[in-house]
Interface confidence: low
């Protein structure tokens, strides 16, 4: 048993252009809090799968209100550590997700509103009892700086917190089967759970009798540094202090194996032993499974029935593609009738209807003339989604309310003179012309 501890140092805009606006404003003051989720192994599971190693929620930070015009600073943080107790062995390799949440303190109905500002994730190797490890992670334009460590809770000790050290009942030597627990000489250690001789600094175990190595160490007891072979290497100059040959550059130097693969030298070159889920010469190829959370947009991931189809994504409505990564252009099906404008809002389709039409798909043709009166004897004509008045002679305008001057448009051709008349207009034609509009 033990505790994983996380100390958040800062959360604020990252370097470079596109710095985010402050998440809080004078109108909406807010405060931050953090959630950490731990999972065993080097899986990159979806954030919503169980935090099998444990999870913790920080206290709320101080209330922050943006100062208008000022650049977004690092935001005030909650006090204290985030502590995730673990009851079983510390696995040595783990995945973490750290979420930064904003609590808005405005006048929301039903209390404060929460929203996720940033989520960072990573995969790490970490021995319990070691020093604080520092990290910087970026999520979009935000930057999170933090440190973490795993420590064992007494009586557990060791890199996996699997060795039990019991306080001595008396200052005499430890009882049968027990030996002093270095460096705590006033405690006694229970019989080892790991394989006898497994390096307490570089090895750990999750099952009795095994010895698993931390990164950089190899051998059955994790006592051999990776890429060196002690004094057996013929390369390099002799060391005055040990009399051993100091290894020169070898094919495994710098560990060419990616994704946690371990490197071993071969007569010609090197060979990578890849962790589960990776393959290729340098373990650079990922065999994606559902554990990697490959289905986007809420897609449902189902493990495939055979190795060639490691997973299948069942996409929710509105998404398609092997990873549900493509939004279906539902407007391409032209669901809006009568010239309505289609809007795909993601969670739903909306049709913006032209005047005179209504309904979810603009399928209802409204009676354009309903309740519309045309004045001065005009008659209403439906069409095109809007009403139109056909006005009686001498009247015009949208509702036939305007008195029309029939001569205003100069309807009489070839210099004919126009006279307004109760029944319309009369043209007095110039000599040599005739017709109602003097057109002949």
């Amino acid at each position: 048993a033990g505790v994983f501890e996380l100390q958040i140092h800062s959360f604020g805009p990252g370097p470079g252009p596109g710095a985010p606006r402050s998440p809080c404003s004078a109108r909406l003051p807010c405060r931050l809090f953090f959630r950490v989720c731990l999972k065993p192994g080097l899986s990159e599971e979806a954030a919503e799968s169980p935090c099998a190693l444990g999870a913790a929620l920080s206290a709320r930070g101080p209330v922050y209100t943006e100062q208008p015009g000022a650049p977004a600073p690092d935001l005030p943080l909650p006090d204290g550590l985030l502590q995730v107790p673990f009851r079983d062995a510390w696995p040595g390799t783990f995945s973490f997700i750290i979420e930064t949440w904003r609590e808005e303190l405005g006048d929301q109905i039903g209390g404060p509103a929460w929203s996720l500002l940033a989520r960072v994730a990573g995969r790490r190797r970490l021995a319990a009892g070691g020093p604080w490890a520092r990290d910087i992670q970026r999520a979009g334009a935000w930057e999170l700086r933090f440190s973490y460590r795993a420590r064992c809770e007494p009586p557990a000790v060791g890199t996996a917190c699997t060795r039990l050290c019991r306080p001595r009942s008396a200052p005499s030597r430890c009882g049968p089967g027990l030996r002093p627990c270095a460096p705590l000489e006033d405690e006694c250690e229970a019989p080892l759970v790991c394989r006898a001789g497994c390096s307490p600094e570089h090895g750990f175990c999750e099952q009795p009798g095994e010895c698993r190595c931390l990164e950089g160490w190899t051998g059955p007891l994790c006592t051999v540094p990776v890429s060196t072979s002690s004094c057996l290497s013929p390369r390099g100059p002799s060391s005055a202090t040990t009399g051993c040959l100091v290894p020169g550059p070898g094919p495994c130097d710098g560990n060419p194996c990616a994704n946690g693969g371990s490197c071993s030298e071969t007569p010609r070159s090197f060979e990578c032993t890849c962790p589960r889920g990776f393959y290729g010469l340098r373990c650079e190829v990922s065999g994606v499974t559902c554990a990697d959370g490959p289905c986007f947009n809420g897609g449902l991931c189902v493990g495939g029935a055979d190795p060639d189809s490691a997973y299948i994504c069942h996409c929710p409505p509105g998404f398609q593609g092997s990873n549900c990564e493509k939004r279906v252009d539902r407007c391409s099906l032209q669901p809006c009738r009568n010239g309505g404008l289609c809007l795909d809002l993601g969670h739903a389709l909306r049709c913006r209807c032209r005047a005179g039409f209504a309904g979810p798909r603009c399928e209802h043709d409204l009676d354009d003339c309903a309740g519309r009166a045309c004045a001065n004897g005009g008659t209403c004509v439906e069409g095109g989604g809007a009403h139109r008045c056909s006005c009686a002679l001498g009247f015009g305008g949208r509702d036939c309310r305007e008195r029309a001057d029939p001569c205003a448009a100069r309807p009489c051709a070839h210099g004919g003179r126009c006279y307004a008349h109760f029944s319309g207009l009369v043209c007095a034609c110039a000599p040599g012309y005739m017709g109602a509009r003097c057109e002949f």
């Epitope: 959630r35 065993p40 192994g41 899986s43 599971e45 979806a46 954030a47 919503e48 799968s49 169980p50 935090c51 099998a52 444990g54 999870a55 929620l57 696995p91 929460w114 999750e206 589960r276 889920g277 499974t289 559902c290 554990a291 959370g293 289905c295 809420g298 897609g299 449902l300 991931c301 189902v302 493990g303 495939g304 029935a305 055979d306 190795p307 490691a310 997973y311």
Partner: antibody
Framework: EVQLVESGGGLVQPGGSLRLSCAAS????????MHWVRQAPGKGLEWVAY????????SYADSVKGRFTISADTSKNTAYLQMNSLRAEDTAVYYC????????????WGQGTLVTVSS | DIQMTQSPSSLSASVGDRVTITCRAS??????VAWYQQKPGKAPKLLIY???SLYSGVPSRFSGSRSGTDFTLTISSLQPEDFATYYC?????????FGQGTKVEIK
């Protein structure tokens, strides 16, 4: 077609042991969470344990911790629940279910096997 | 452990009714909430995952929503085959926990 078939249930005395099996077909259990969920007569659902065989990782409900052990044999595509020190309150129908990853709902369930602990 | 408090514990409704069942989590559980339907003598069936996503093959009259730590299952128009017991379940934090169930009976 995905299928889960439980077996191994039966009548056992308090303090006794039983081993339940969950044989899976139509998918590979090594890349799935495998759960055991139980339901006492006339009661609601209670999650018991899960295993993620790829990493051998297990998790248990407090009520069974130290008494029950979940395991898997990926070569047989089968998950197991070893139940020791059984008590009367462990009497229930035990279901095996497959858990999804992205959402962690349990999308496929077995038909259940009844475990009765009684003297 | 996270408690999932489900209400009501039972309700009577008629065919065609709109039915709403709620679940409140004792702390934030992200959207990792699922809803199940169970009929007597049968295994539960997944209806909703990730709080609001409809599982494939489930009729569209079922829907799920989330507001903070409150989760809701809605049946828009109850059908004869919908009379059953419904459970919510959270999977954001270990241990996984279920609500105590809501029995939907015929009025």
């Amino acid at each position: 077609e995905v299928q889960l078939v439980e077996s191994g249930g039966g009548l056992v005395q308090p303090g006794g042991s039983l081993r339940l099996s969950c044989a899976a077909s139509g998918f590979n259990i090594s890349s799935s969470y495998m759960h055991w969920v139980r339901q006492a007569p006339g009661k609601g659902l209670e999650w018991v344990a899960y295993i993620y065989p790829s990493y051998g990782y297990t998790s248990y409900a407090d009520s069974v911790k130290g008494r029950f052990t979940i395991s898997a044999d990926t070569s047989k595509n089968t998950a197991y629940l070893q139940m020791n020190s059984l008590r009367a309150e462990d009497t229930a129908v035990y279901y095996c279910a497959r858990g999804g990853y992205y959402y962690h709902g349990m999308d496929y369930w077995g038909q259940g096997t009844l475990v009765t602990v009684s003297s | 452990d996270i408690q999932m408090t489900q209400s009501p514990s039972s309700l009577s409704a008629s065919v065609g009714d709109r039915v709403t069942i709620t679940c409140r989590a004792s702390q934030s559980v992200s959207s990792a909430v699922a809803w199940y339907q169970q009929k007597p003598g049968k295994a539960p069936k997944l209806l909703i995952y990730s709080a609001s996503s409809l599982y494939s093959g489930v009729p569209s009259r079922f829907s799920g929503s989330r507001s903070g730590t409150d989760f809701t299952l809605t049946i828009s128009s109850l059908q004869p085959e919908d009379f059953a017991t419904y459970y919510c379940q959270q999977a954001s934090w270990s241990p996984i926990t279920f609500g105590q169930g809501t029995k939907v009976e015929i009025k």
